[in-house]
């Protein structure tokens, strides 16, 4: 490990927010990746333990991929015997840090995503206020979640084939966690924000979606002004 001579110090996690999912339950035959992004000076080394013992490729059929540049452990086509606690140990001469992940391998039938009943819920908001729509997704397979807003094109809500016109407001990306995708936040709403919103969840089996409506009311001052204008 190289020592640059500046800011020498013990290892630390560079992306702790990416490490908060400590229990991973995945269907058999899927690929699993554990990451422990870290830094330190000198650059720390990373090693992996399974159930507290050194973990090497020959310990499992299909082997493992250790990507030191990405601080990751990859296991393809997981089987029930891969269940257990996986610990990354990151160390340099100034110290050592570790993180343990628990892997559960599921053998039940994967299904299309199940969305919690009643979510997202219809909302009524005052002009200029903030609104949150929630969507709770249950899926054996990794779901791909999108938030859509239904829009009109040339006065029509649907295309020639009957497909609704939608615009994607939020979708899975490199910097978006599953938790973040379960909430759609609208700030300082305008009358244009009123309409139908859809939470769409897909996996390798299929899609499921739930919709909700946002009604935007004028602010109270506007209501008062309207009343005064209408008085004799």
């Amino acid at each position: 490990a190289e020592d640059t001579g500046v800011d020498t110090g013990a290892p630390y996690w560079t992306r702790p927010e990416r490490m908060d999912k400590k229990l991973l339950a995945v269907p058999a035959a899927n690929t699993v990746r554990f990451r422990c992004p870290a830094a330190g000076n000198p650059t720390p080394s990373i090693s992996w333990l399974k159930n507290g013992r050194e973990f090497r490729g020959e310990h499992r059929i299909g082997g493992i991929k250790l990507r030191h540049q990405q601080w990751s452990l990859v296991m393809e086509s997981v089987v029930p015997s891969d269940r257990g606690n996986y610990t990354c140990v990151v160390e340099n001469k100034f110290g050592s840090i570790r993180q343990t992940y628990t892997l559960d391998v599921l053998e039940r039938s994967p299904h299309r995503p199940i969305l919690q009943a009643g979510l997202p819920a219809n909302q009524t908001a005052v002009l200029g206020s903030d609104v949150e729509f929630h969507c709770k997704v249950y899926s054996d397979a990794q779901p791909h979640i999108q938030w859509l807003k239904h829009v009109e094109v040339n006065g029509s809500k649907v295309g020639p084939d009957g497909t609704p016109y939608v615009t994607v407001l939020k979708t899975a990306g490199a910097n978006t966690t599953d938790k973040e995708l379960e909430v759609l936040s609208l700030h300082n709403v305008t009358f244009e924000d009123a309409g139908e919103y859809t939470c769409l969840a897909g996996n390798s089996i299929g899609f499921s979606h739930h919709s909700a409506w946002l009604v935007v009311l004028p602010a109270e001052e506007e209501l008062v002004e309207a009343d005064e204008a209408g008085s004799v």
């Epitope: 009943a117 497909t163 939608v166 089996i205």
Partner: antibody
Framework: EVQLLESGGGVVQPGRSLRLSCAAS????????MHWVRQAPGKGLEWVAV????????YYADSVKGRFTISRDNSKNTLSLQMNSLRVEDTAIYYC?????????????????WGQGTMVTVSS | DIVMTQTPLSLSVTPGQPASISCRSS???????????VYWYVQKSGQPPQLLIY???NRFSGVPDRFSGSGSRTDFTLKISRVEAEDVGVYYC?????????FGGGTKVEIK
């Protein structure tokens, strides 16, 4: 035109291996899950396996689990099925089928486009 | 696994007459999003299956309106209002809720 074209079928002895391929065209292959379905001569349809759009999720029928491996190469618009330890009962026409895509489903969310199939015969 | 049971095994129909095929699932196919994920296919001799009906009752593009799907939860029906000679083939129902995806055993439709 949306098309799926299977290849790689043939006659093979029990215990041997075979690799099937499916070339996709006319749609954004990398946005769709893909399936294999088979049909034994004179019999009904049996689902074999599925792979997610990015290859990270794979599921198999119990009858092929541990013997067959589904994979994909999105850069080449190709789906594959590696079949090992073949048995006489694996004899069938193997169809490549388009699964669920990304985005708001326009009509059915998959299982709408089937290839013509490729015949696999396992016989001693 | 969800078992799909199809009846009858075969059907001989006079052209212009209606035909009905039943399919029963061992579990409800009504999903949390309110849709019922049963699909219907026809397979003509030497060809791959062709999609007719998706999500219980939606006709796939290009499918004649003499084909219709109905039912609820575990009992489903495919109806052909007036059978034509070109409708000959084997008809299959399929559940698209969970893996393994499963098909009915098929119903062979012939013309009298």
């Amino acid at each position: 035109e949306v098309q799926l074209l299977e290849s790689g079928g043939g006659v093979v002895q029990p215990g041997r291996s075979l690799r099937l391929s499916c070339a996709a065209s006319g749609f954004t292959f990398s946005s769709y899950a893909m399936h294999w379905v088979r049909q034994a001569p004179g019999k009904g349809l049996e689902w074999v396996a599925v792979i997610s759009y990015d290859g990270s999720n794979k599921y198999y029928a119990d009858s092929v689990k541990g013997r067959f491996t589904i994979s994909r190469d999105n850069s080449k618009n190709t789906l594959s099925l590696q079949m090992n330890s073949l048995r006489v009962e694996d004899t069938a026409i193997y169809y490549c089928v388009r699964g669920a895509g990304h985005g708001f489903p326009t009509g059915p969310d998959g299982f709408d486009i089937w290839g013509q199939g490729t015949m696999v015969t396992v016989s001693s | 696994d969800i078992v799909m049971t199809q009846t009858p095994l075969s059907l001989s129909v006079t052209p212009g007459q209606p035909a009905s095929i039943s399919c029963r699932s061992s579990r409800s196919l009504l999903h949390s999003d309110g849709k019922t994920y049963v699909y219907w296919y026809v397979q003509k001799s030497g060809q791959p299956p062709q999609l007719l009906i998706y999500e219980l009752s939606n006709r796939f593009s290009g499918v004649p309106d003499r084909f219709s799907g109905s039912g609820s939860r575990t009992d489903f029906t495919l109806k052909i209002s007036r059978v034509e000679a070109e409708d000959v083939g084997v008809y299959y129902c399929m559940q698209y809720v969970e893996a393994p995806l499963t098909f009915g055993g098929g119903t062979k439709v012939e013309i009298k």
